[in-house]
């Protein structure tokens, strides 16, 4: 008679995570007497999946009734498949022995691959804000997918980006994989309303990619521009000087007025005007009693934006009976001290 053969008809089976996997196995003979076992992997480190003779295997059910007379079908079904179940499964016939059964013949193996969806991509931006014309990095991460093949794209406001680097880990065999990508984005002044999108395509997503987004508003700081002007006043002994703070982002802004280097008033911006591009404007004014000053007065508008080093603009108010409406303004960076160098009138 022909010697028993162990037939595993499928070389490979692919199953989505959560489903059941059926692994088929048939014998060509009832002889020799002895149990069959299923193993994952081969060689010394193999893992017992099912033993016909003994043991408790809650996730494994046999497709046929193994105790049925003349049964040659030893197929099994494994429920609730996870990526950790991936591997090659061997159906193995043992010959009855004493004290232990002896492996007699093995099937050629069926490779079980598990299709697992990637997790929703998480996009994170830089820890510190940057100003326009600077480059910032965004990272995108997704985990738990299988098989390894995956496509990742970056977009900024719908336009595909090319400056990015992507890694899929681990490099070798694994039950599931992770992807990590870093994109470099050059900021522009109009990026307060901009968005970066990380898009992931995988076989398990059936052409409907996953997207993760980040707002550039979290990454950008647009520094303000200052303009100090004198407004006409009816009363000759008063001067109204305004400081127009324009096109800044984010909101956080503190303004200090100095008269000849001495702090006159400090205020925090509250009622802001929002521009179409998402930046803000704000105006502050200072009423100066010219009677209180014998000499010309240098008025300085000093602005600290988003915790950065203060910027300031000065205006020289000339105290003169005939020159109340003219002056010259001076812009400079103020150091940490609230005082600023005085500018001459021009």
């Amino acid at each position: 008679e022909d010697e028993l053969q162990v037939i595993q008809p499928e070389k490979s089976v692919s199953v989505a995570a959560g489903e059941s996997a059926t692994l088929r196995c048939a014998m060509t003979s009832l002889i020799p007497v002895g149990p069959i076992m299923w193993f994952r992997g081969a060689g010394a480190g193999r893992e017992l999946i099912y033993n016909q003779k003994e043991g408790h295997f809650p996730r494994v059910t046999t497709v046929s009734e193994l105790t049925k007379r003349n049964n040659l079908d030893f197929s099994i079904s494994i429920s609730n498949i996870t990526p950790a179940d991936a591997g090659t499964y061997y159906c193995v016939k043992f010959r009855k022995g004493s004290p232990d059964d002896v492996e007699f013949k093995s099937g050629a193996g069926t490779e079980l691959s598990v299709r697992a969806k990637p997790s929703a991509p998480v996009v994170s931006g830089p820890a510190v804000r940057a100003t326009p014309e600077h480059t910032v990095s965004f990272t995108c991460e997704s985990h738990g997918f299988s098989p390894r093949d995956i496509t990742l794209k970056w977009f900024k406001n719908g336009n595909e980006l090319s400056d990015f680097q992507t890694n899929v880990d681990p490099a070798g065999d694994s039950v599931s994989y992770s992807i990590h990508s870093t994109a470099r984005v050059v900021l522009t002044r109009g990026d307060v309303h901009s968005q970066v999108i990380c898009e992931i395509a995988h076989i398990t997503l059936q052409g409907d990619p996953l997207r993760g987004t980040a707002n550039l508003s979290e990454a950008i700081r647009v520094p303000p521009t200052l303009e100090v002007t004198q407004q006409p006043m009816r009363a000759e002994n008063q001067a109204n000087v305004t400081c127009q703070v324009s096109n800044f982002y984010p909101r956080g802004l503190q303004l200090t007025w100095l008269e000849n280097g001495n702090v006159s008033r400090t205020e925090t911006a509250s009622t802001l005007i929002e521009n179409k591009d998402g930046t803000y404007n704000w105006m502050s004014w200072l009423l100066v009693n010219t009677c209180a000053h014998r000499d010309d007065v240098v008025l300085t508008c000093q602005v600290e934006h988003d915790g950065q080093q203060a910027v300031s603009k000065s205006y020289a108010l000339e105290i003169s009976a005939h020159q109340k409406e003219h002056g010259s303004d001076i812009t400079h960076e103020a150091a940490l001290a609230p005082t600023a160098p005085l500018g001459g009138s021009g």
Partner: antibody, heavy 122, light 112 residues
Framework: QVQLQESGPGLVRPSETLSLTCTVS????????WSWIRQPPGKGLEWIGF???????FYNSSLKSRVTISLDMSMNQFSLKMTSVTAADTAVYYC????????????????WGQGTTVTVSS | DIVMTQSPLSLPVTPGEPASISCKSS???????????LDWYLQRPGQSPQLLIY???NRASGVPDRFSGSGSGTDFTLKISRVEAEDVGVFYC?????????FGGGTKVEIK
């Protein structure tokens, strides 16, 4: 570049417990088997046992009753405990990484520690 | 347990000449997936063993191509096409088909 470093006492009293730790640096414990192998002075290599990253253990039946191999993935370490030691357990003890691929099985012990000498003596 | 037997016990070699070591197993190391579960290792004096060949005939990363493994079932051979001075040490075969993993007794290669 993965490196393995054995640590533990060089001298153990007879009947006491031998405890060794292997620290894995420069790589992950995942997807590998982690083995202990010993070599008595002037003799050949003897496999003690190994542990898979998921915690499954395999032991040499001749030592099984005395040996425990455990894994601490958070510390990137695995350990060997051998109870009731005798002079016959005097050896250089190696920890090693065994590659494994699904469908193939073990395909080579590719990274070895430099070995640590353990002497069992009173 | 699978018993591994190596021969010769000692092998004096001349640099530049070929050398061959035999390893026999007490049962077949060829599995149904077509792989032979046999590895070869070299332990140089005072060093840890180093993987040379895995699964019967696959050269490990960084191993010079003068080393080759052959054989199937129960009979295996490690060949060195041209021995170099750095090849001195003890060569071991090891089976990885079943636990316990078992090693051959070793073949000591030394320069004549």
């Amino acid at each position: 570049q993965v490196q393995l470093q054995e640590s533990g006492p060089g001298l153990v009293r007879p009947s006491e417990t031998l405890s060794l730790t292997c620290t894995v640096s420069g790589g992950s414990i995942r997807n590998y088997y982690w083995s202990w192998i010993r070599q008595p002075p002037g003799k050949g290599l003897e496999w003690i046992g190994f542990i898979y990253y998921n915690g499954r253990t395999f032991y040499n039946s001749s030592l099984k009753s005395r040996v425990t191999i455990s894994l601490d993935m958070s510390m990137n370490q695995f350990s060997l405990k051998m109870t009731s030691v005798t002079a016959a357990d005097t050896a250089v003890y190696y920890c090693a990484r065994v590659r494994a691929y699904s469908g193939i099985g073990l395909d080579g012990t590719d990274v070895w520690g430099q070995g640590t000498t353990v002497t069992v003596s009173s | 347990d699978i018993v591994m037997t190596q021969s010769p016990l000692s092998l004096p070699v001349t640099p530049g000449e070929p050398a061959s070591i035999s390893c026999k197993s007490s049962q077949s190391l060829l599995y149904s997936n077509g792989y032979n579960y046999l590895d070869w290792y070299l332990q140089r004096p005072g060093q840890s063993p180093q993987l040379l060949i895995y699964l019967g005939s696959n050269r490990a990363s960084g191993v010079p191509d003068r080393f080759s493994g052959s054989g199937s079932g129960t009979d295996f051979t490690l060949k060195i096409s041209r021995v170099e001075a750095e090849d001195v040490g003890v060569f071991y075969c090891m089976q990885a088909l079943q636990t316990p993993l078992t090693f051959g007794g070793g073949t000591k290669v030394e320069i004549k």
